[in-house]
Amino acid sequence: TPEVWVQVRMEATELSSFTIRCGFLGSGSISLVTVSWGGPNGAGGTTLAVLHPERGIRQWAPARQARWETQSSISLILEGSGASSPCANTTFCCKFASFPEGSWEACGSLPPSSDPGLSAPPTPAPILRAD
């Protein structure tokens, strides 16, 4: 069964700057990745970035830089200032549309006891929804 993992890290240099990394553990071809915060995309969450393998990347503040790390994983850096900046208990979600498996989504947040600059290892997060 395909799985999605989510890793959230707070940057040591900027305490309100976050890096979100997400990956897809499955055999299919990724057709679209959507990163959101505040809950799953389409269920109260707000889209931060959408990544398409051929057509490129779209991102919305406070997202600063979204990019592909591998063919099945992405990273997103969030700007750490302003009213819309994330806080330590913010939930981030990644939805991978995979061809032909369908859509798989998981969420994660900063580990409760993590020090700035540290993060939990990228273990598979619970799958919230598979369309």
């Epitope: 071809s29 051929e54 779209r58 991102q59 919305w60 061809f99 032909p100």
Partner: antibody, heavy 117, light 107 residues
Amino acid sequence: EVQLVESGGGLVQPGGSLRLSCAASGFTFRNYDMHWVRQVPGKGLEWVSDIGNSGETYYLGSVKGRFTISRENAKNSLYLQMNSLRAGDTAVYYCVREEFGYGMDVWGQGTTVTVSS
Amino acid sequence: DIQMTQSPSSLSASVGDRVTITCRASQGIRNDLGWYQQKPGKAPKRLIYAASSLQSGVPSRFSGSGSGTEFTLTISSLQPEDFATYYCLQHNSYPLTFGGGTKVEIK
């Protein structure tokens, strides 16, 4: 209600210029890619240009360097500046919305551009 | 550029008929494909997105299938209001490209 309303079409001579506008309402404009698609009367549909939420632009090869797509998110407006117009640019031009990666879903009613001497 | 070859270019059918329209992509596009209906003097209207998902408000007699390079739009029981021209659109890569269209006429 989600709505797209084009304006600015008309008759122009070959080599001339025209600026099309599209007024969007009923949705969060800045969250969507916006496209221009054209159709020669009685013929098929042809994609012309796309602009991303932050202003990334993409063009059909035959219009690159002559057409410029732009947007004003604060005004919920999309534009197409068309220069060095040719007879082959004669068409109905549609403004179209896309939730990026999911395809075009909402179309305006179109505005007609005629390039003729 | 990805070419979308749509067939047939026109067809004649009767109310109640099952109608099938095909689009073939010149290279794989996964499921980045939509189907549109256009009536004379009107803007196109989306029927199907992601190759097989029905657009909200569209009657269930319309269905889409396929992936990769071969795609099909099926109208299970043609109704009088379905006589129109149908187009496929690939949004997998730039430039986005439409099929040539299929005009569905009354027999």
